[in-house]
């Protein structure tokens, strides 16, 4: 059962796993949610009746029954983890805590103009978990405006104390706001020879990389595959760090793989969700339950629905035994990973999908697409919406993309003559315009947010957000697309598609069926040569064939330029402008979405 509210002046008795320090009960709940075993917590707020050494303690708790006895205690705030909830979860914490000093290892000290600048510095520093900033009112003159970057083994403070005229806060890496590089490559036959901060068992290098990503201290990893010569080290995932943030030594070793934390790309690829099945593989761990199940998929479902289950092993039924049902072993461990991995015993193993809700919805794999042809099929581009105006009569105005359950990203120039959001309708999950009838459900628009610096499409800033009046329930036919990570600025996208209901030639009409075209990206240098009278800025991105023939056109405006990278679709561009349509040596010009990620997050995460 999902319980989100906090219980004031209440303490849960027993069940302690560990104690951490957090600046608020709200953040204690987030820490509990991300901890592999925590189901409940008790936080102690600052209070004259409490011993100051106990202020800000966050006691993480577990219970076989998923609840614990409650005791009244002043200043105690208790609650449940969000593991039991189905809603999207985020570790992003933008709060600034006034007059609190969050203790940790102070590894960097510098002058900053503001707490915001200090927080940005922390977000863009590979080691930083949180910071404390001494304001200009701080009593000690030499410490004023000093920004202390801090880290700890757990990613949370080792202690929190009251201190006048300082402010503290956390890195915004988990808010997708870091400019650090996103290195997705996994390097085969490579060992990183730096210090290990932890080690866990993992079935493959991808799971190892994802574990590294949400481990607070891990910057890179080395994984020993099941063919690794030393048997005791097979399937071992070594979580590593270094002072520089990069591996100091790379050793060539067969059957080992190495890679980097995906911290700076976590909003555009799954880092919590281990959805694969591992055949002929047994995961060992503490047994939670043994249940009969028809298949390994059914076993995974059972594990996902059991809040304490972290991973499972399914042993298929022996012929005609137990109505064809096999045994499903639901398991857990102290760190969420198997204590040992065995091969050759015929089991099928995997992980709970409960953690998938900690990943961005946009990373969910969508139905395989039918390549070739220009008409799309249903569910092929589930983020694509058609934006209609109802004034003076109803018609398709522009395309747009679902980027959140209340947000559509589109182009600013679409709103020429639109004097009120009341005349707009957003239709999602649509393949053919002819599906839209009087009674077709739509999303009303609460607010149109146009970039302040937009003047005309050709000079850039051609970007707008629509805040919907109601939230979108994600399904196979309507779901969000990932924004590109700022750390992905140097990625070369090779699988890009433009979609829309726009014209198929310059003098035409809106198409009934959603059209698609695969279009290669063009460098800004090349694009600038094709548009000598314009300034093609880094905030624009171009796509097109040298010979022309395929392009976006009138009516496609505001729609997505979607690029697939590492099996995840990213909203790389917004259809903006171009000379004619599909002309030779005249690529289409798109708004370069990665350059507006900060703007998008600022507007969509505003309180």
């Amino acid at each position: 059962e999902c319980v989100t509210q906090l219980l004031k002046d209440t303490c849960f008795e027993g069940g302690d796993i560990t104690t951490v320090f957090t600046p608020s009960a709200k953040y204690c709940q987030v820490v509990c949610t991300y901890h592999p075993r925590c189901l409940l917590f008790t936080f102690t707020a600052e209070s004259p009746s409490e011993d100051p050494t106990r202020w800000f303690t966050c006691v993480l708790k577990d219970s076989v029954t998923e609840t614990l006895p409650r005791v009244n205690r002043t200043a105690a705030i208790s609650g449940y983890s969000f593991k039991q909830c189905s809603h999207q979860i985020s570790a992003c914490n933008k709060d600034i805590y006034v007059d609190l000093d969050m203790k940790g290892i102070n590894y960097n000290s510098s002058v900053a103009k503001s707490a915001q600048e200090c927080q940005e510095r922390c977000t863009d520093d590979v080691h930083c978990h949180f910071f404390t900033y001494a304001t200009r009112q701080f009593p000690s003159l030499e410490h004023r405006n000093i920004c202390l970057l801090k880290h700890t083994q757990t990613g949370t403070p080792t202690r929190i104390t009251k201190l006048d005229k300082v402010v503290s806060g956390f890195s915004l890496k988990s808010c997708a706001l870091s400019n650090l590089a996103c290195i997705r490559d996994i390097f085969p036959n490579t060992v990183f020879a730096d210090s290990n901060i932890d080690s866990v068992m993992a079935p493959d290098a991808f799971v190892c990389g994802r574990i590294c990503t949400h481990h607070p201290g891990c910057l890179f990893f080395t994984f020993f595959s099941q063919e690794w010569p030393k048997e005791s080290q097979r399937n071992l995932c070594l979580l590593k760090t270094s002072e520089s943030g990069l591996p100091s030594t790379r050793i060539k070793k067969s059957k080992a793989l190495s890679g980097f934390s995906l911290q700076s790309c976590r909003h555009s690829i799954p880092v919590f969700c281990h959805s694969s099945f591992y055949h002929d593989t047994d995961f060992l761990g503490e047994e939670l339950d043994i249940v009969a199940a028809k298949s390994h998929e059914a076993c995974q479902k059972l594990c996902t629905n059991a809040v304490r289950c972290q991973f499972f092993t399914y042993t298929p039924a022996q012929a005609s035994c137990n109505e064809g049902k096999g045994k499903c072993y639901l398991k857990l461990s102290s760190n969420g990973s198997p204590t040992k991995i065995l091969h050759g015993r015929g089991g099928i193993s995997g992980y709970t999908l409960r953690l998938c809700k900690m990943d961005n919805e946009c990373t969910t794999k969508i139905k395989p697409r039918i390549v070739g042809g220009t008409a799309s099929v249903r569910g092929e581009w589930p983020w694509q919406v058609t934006l209609h105006t109802t004034s003076p009569t109803q018609r398709h105005l522009c395309g747009g993309s679902i980027i959140g359950n209340q947000w559509i990203l589109t182009a600013a120039h679409c709103f020429y003559g639109v004097e009120s959001p009341k005349i707009l309708r957003v239709y999602s999950g649509i393949l053919n315009q002819s599906e839209i009838k009087e009674d077709t459900s739509f999303f009303g628009v609460q607010e149109i947010i146009i970039h302040d610096q937009y003047k005309m499409a050709e000079s850039g800033y051609d970007i707008a957000l629509l805040k919907l009046e109601t939230t979108v329930n994600y399904t196979d036919s309507q779901r969000p697309i990932c924004l590109p990570s700022k750390g992905d600025r140097n990625v070369i996208y090779t699988d890009c598609w433009v979609t829309g209901w726009g014209y198929r030639k310059l003098r035409d009409k809106i198409q009934n069926t959603l059209q698609k075209a695969k279009i290669p990206l063009v460098t800004n240098e090349e694009c600038q040569k094709r548009y000598r009278g314009h300034k093609i800025t880094h905030k624009m991105i171009c796509a097109g064939y040298r010979e022309g023939g395929k392009d976006a056109c009138k009516g496609d405006s505001g729609g997505p330029l979607s690029c697939k990278h590492n099996e995840v679709w990213h909203l790389v561009g917004i259809t903006s402008w171009g000379e004619g349509c599909a002309q030779r040596e005249r690529p289409g010009v798109y708004t370069n979405v990665v350059e507006y990620v900060d703007w998008i997050l600022e507007k969509t995460q505003a309180v």
Epitope: A411, A412, H413, F415, Y416, G417, V418, E419, I448, I450, D452, Q453, Y454, K455, M456, A457, E458, D462, G502, C553, K554, G555, S557, S576, W577, G578, E579, V589
Partner: antibody
């Protein structure tokens, strides 16, 4: 409701600077663009320039060397200055608000007549 | 700068009859973003101008449906299906595709 009101001296001497203020209400200058348009007596409309909502300005090329548009967002005012005026600058001066984008002009002030004469 | 030429400059019409005003541009008004930033304004005697149409043919709310617009590229037309006495005034086309923005010289519609 949305209102724009032009104000300023009705008479300006040749070679002096014409100064007008457009005071707005019912909307923010950081959300909408404001244009200046003029109309000499018995003649057509002439676009003078725009104060974009981000504070940038853009002017009619024939007036560019003489015109300055500025704003004071705290007072909800946009100002027009036209230097070195001649009798040809005698006109009714309008301020108008752009739409969600630059245009169309969805709201207009009632206009103020400025006569250039010694 | 873009020059907009309106014809006729004066248009006497009998009430109930149709009327048509042409606006020709010195260069195409089709923007590279797909929009055509061509608008029509009416200035009634002693009043400020008011917008009738934007994007060639789109009526703003409150504008009677007897007003319609058509055209593309450089040639545009405003049509009034049946002129009424309240339609008297000066009609201006206006372009915002190319800076600096420009008005046509105006067409005076009067009742015969």
């Amino acid at each position: 409701q949305v209102q724009l009101q032009e104000s300023g001296p009705g008479l300006v001497k040749p070679s002096e600077t014409l100064s007008l203020t457009c005071t707005v209400s019912g909307f923010s200058l950081t959300t909408y663009h404001v244009h200046w348009v003029r109309q000499p007596p018995g003649k057509g409309l002439e676009w003078i320039g725009i104060m974009w909502r981000d504070g940038d300005t853009y002017y009619n090329s024939s007036l560019k060397s003489r015109v300055t548009i500025s704003r004071d967002t705290s007072k909800n005012q946009v100002s027009l200055k036209l230097s070195s005026v001649t009798a040809a600058d005698t006109a009714v001066y309008f301020c108008a608000r752009g739409g969600t984008l630059t245009t169309p002009f969805t709201y207009w002030g009632q206009g103020t007549l400025v006569t250039v004469s010694s | 700068d873009v020059v907009l030429t309106q014809t006729p400059l004066s248009l006497p019409v009998t009430p109930g009859e149709p009327a048509s005003i042409s606006c020709r541009s010195s260069q195409s008004l089709e923007s590279r973003d797909g929009n055509t930033y061509l608008e029509w304004y009416l200035q009634k005697p002693g009043q400020s101008p008011q917008v009738l149409l934007y994007g060639v043919s789109n009526r703003l709310s409150g504008v009677p449906d007897r007003f319609s617009g058509s055209g593309s590229g450089t040639d545009f037309t405003l049509k009034i299906s049946r002129v009424e006495a309240e339609d008297v005034g000066v009609y201006y086309c206006f372009q915002a595709t190319h800076g600096p923005f420009t008005f046509g010289q105006g067409t005076k519609l009067e009742i015969k």
